[in-house]
Interface confidence: medium
């Protein structure tokens, strides 16, 4: 018997589909063999040969079996207030996320197009809702009996110290000063410490998501920046 | 497991009617196109008809065409064989056949029904 | 006559190596379409034995090989046991038919 030869291309039978990692080329109207990750195709298939692939040159990558003529272009390098969390392969695009401090304001399919500083609220205002990757901080005002005294995206609203005998009384962005030696806290409702932002990554344990297989084809149009919220300060 | 059963076979005089079917059962039938195939004693095989998953499509051989119709019911998971005007040469055990869906090929087959033309 | 030719008959001694030929036309194996090869014992359904030339579907002892080139196919069966004595057929789609057509059969006997 003589040597296998290579199944594809062929001609797919109706009611049959061609098997996974082919195509149908129209022109040759055969079931024909993709290029894998990393490789673009460089002759497409007739009736009597199969596709040939090629590797893809720097700074450019295909992420999935594919049979397109050209690799796709990497992004462009990440920006200052970017760090890369993966670099750019000839198997996978380069992806940018926003440093510590700073959230997407306008992402893309893999990572972020557009990074924001977080709001700081000023004192007076404590922290409502962290921020997170892809959400900015909001403040809110301190309610009577607890203040914030620190321009901060972490810091919320902390109860008064209560006094035996007050000697300045606390506002919303000072606390009670006391004259007696034994100061107490009090156990405001609801005054919990809210953890940091994810965005931070001061406390960042989980593993980040696997990148998405599908090819960036859609166009996000760009956003206005968003009014600054009350008591938050002006970067 | 994926399972075909034919029924509907029988003795029948020339030039008259049968209706066969194929219940099946243990895989999406609606992925899968559906095929008869024949065989008349002592001889080979012989294709008789084809569907398309979805019921659009039909094929015929040129020795049934206009005499049987091929069809299927999706939400009852069974296949159609209309035979009309029937012949002594149509005598044969009719197996029902899932095409597979890549690269072709019949994939699985009942256990087949006898069809017997004859005055 | 069938579109598909095949060798009305085959034999061989256990332990050895037999091939069934099926040869086509520009419209069926010519056209890019595959063969697929079918076991049938006696008094049963035959079942699938090969599929898009050297495809075997799980259960199908390595035993048995596919090939095909041009208008020509062939199925290999090594080590050849009793229990393989049964008809064998070829298949194909013909395009100029717009319908599958089948090889007449070879019936393979293990002397």
């Known amino acids: 018997l003589p040597a296998q030869v290579a199944f594809t291309p062929y001609a797919p039978e109706p009611g049959s589909t061609c098997r996974l990692r082919e195509y149908y080329d129209q022109t040759a109207q055969m079931c024909c063999s993709k290029c894998s990750p990393g490789q673009h195709a460089k002759v497409f298939c007739t009736k009597t040969s199969d596709t040939v692939c090629d590797s893809c040159e720097d700074s450019t990558y295909t992420q999935l079996w594919n049979w397109v003529p050209e690799c796709l272009s990497c992004g462009s390098r990440c920006s200052s207030d970017q760090v890369e969390t993966q670099a750019c392969t000839r198997e996978q695009n380069r992806i940018c996320t926003c440093r510590p401090g700073w959230y997407c304001a306008l992402s893309k399919q893999e990572g972020c197009r557009l990074c924001a500083p977080l709001r700081k609220c000023r004192p007076g205002f404590g922290v409502a809702r962290p921020g997170t990757e892809t959400s900015d901080v909001v403040c809110k005002p301190c309610a009577p009996g607890t203040f914030s005294n620190t321009t901060s995206s972490t810091d919320i609203c902390r109860p008064h110290q209560i006094c035996n005998v007050v000697a300045i009384p606390g506002n919303a962005s000072m606390d009670a000063v006391c004259t007696s030696t034994s100061p107490t806290r009090s156990m405001a409702p609801g005054a919990v410490h809210l953890p940091q932002p994810v965005s931070t990554r001061s406390q960042h344990t989980q593993p980040t998501p696997e990148p998405s297989t599908a090819p960036s084809t859609s166009f996000l149009l760009p956003m206005g920046p968003s009014p600054p919220a009350e008591g938050s300060t002006g970067d | 497991q994926v399972q075909l059963l034919e029924s509907g076979g029988g003795l029948v005089q020339p030039g008259g009617s049968l209706r066969l079917s194929c219940a099946a059962s243990?895989?999406?039938?609606?992925?899968?196109?559906m095929t008869w195939v024949r065989q008349a004693p002592g001889k080979g095989l012989e294709w008789v008809s084809g569907i398309s998953g979805d019921g659009a499509a039909t094929f015929y051989a040129d020795s049934v065409k206009g005499r049987f119709t091929i069809s299927r019911d999706n939400s009852k998971n069974t296949l159609y064989l209309q035979m009309n005007s029937l012949r002594a040469e149509d005598t044969a055990v009719y197996y029902c056949a899932r095409q597979s869906q890549y690269v072709g090929g019949f994939d699985y087959w009942g256990q087949g029904t006898l069809v017997t033309v004859s005055s | 006559q069938s579109v598909l030719t095949q060798p009305p008959s085959v034999s061989g001694a256990p332990g050895q190596r037999v091939t069934i030929s099926c040869t086509g036309s520009?419209?069926?194996?010519?056209?890019?379409?595959?063969v697929h090869w079918y076991q049938q014992l006696p008094g049963t359904a035959p079942k699938l034995l090969i599929h898009?030339?050297?495809n075997r579907p799980s259960g199908v002892p390595d035993r048995f090989s596919g090939f095909k080139s041009g208008t020509s196919a062939s199925l290999a069966i090594t080590g050849l046991q009793a229990e393989d004595e049964a008809d064998y057929y070829c298949q194909s789609y013909d395009s100029s038919l717009s319908g599958w057509v089948f090889g007449g059969g070879t019936k393979l006997t293990v002397l």
């Open positions: 898009g030339n050297t």
């Open positions: 520009s419209s069926n194996f010519g056209a890019g379409y595959g």
């Open positions: 243990g895989f999406s039938f609606t992925s899968y196109a």
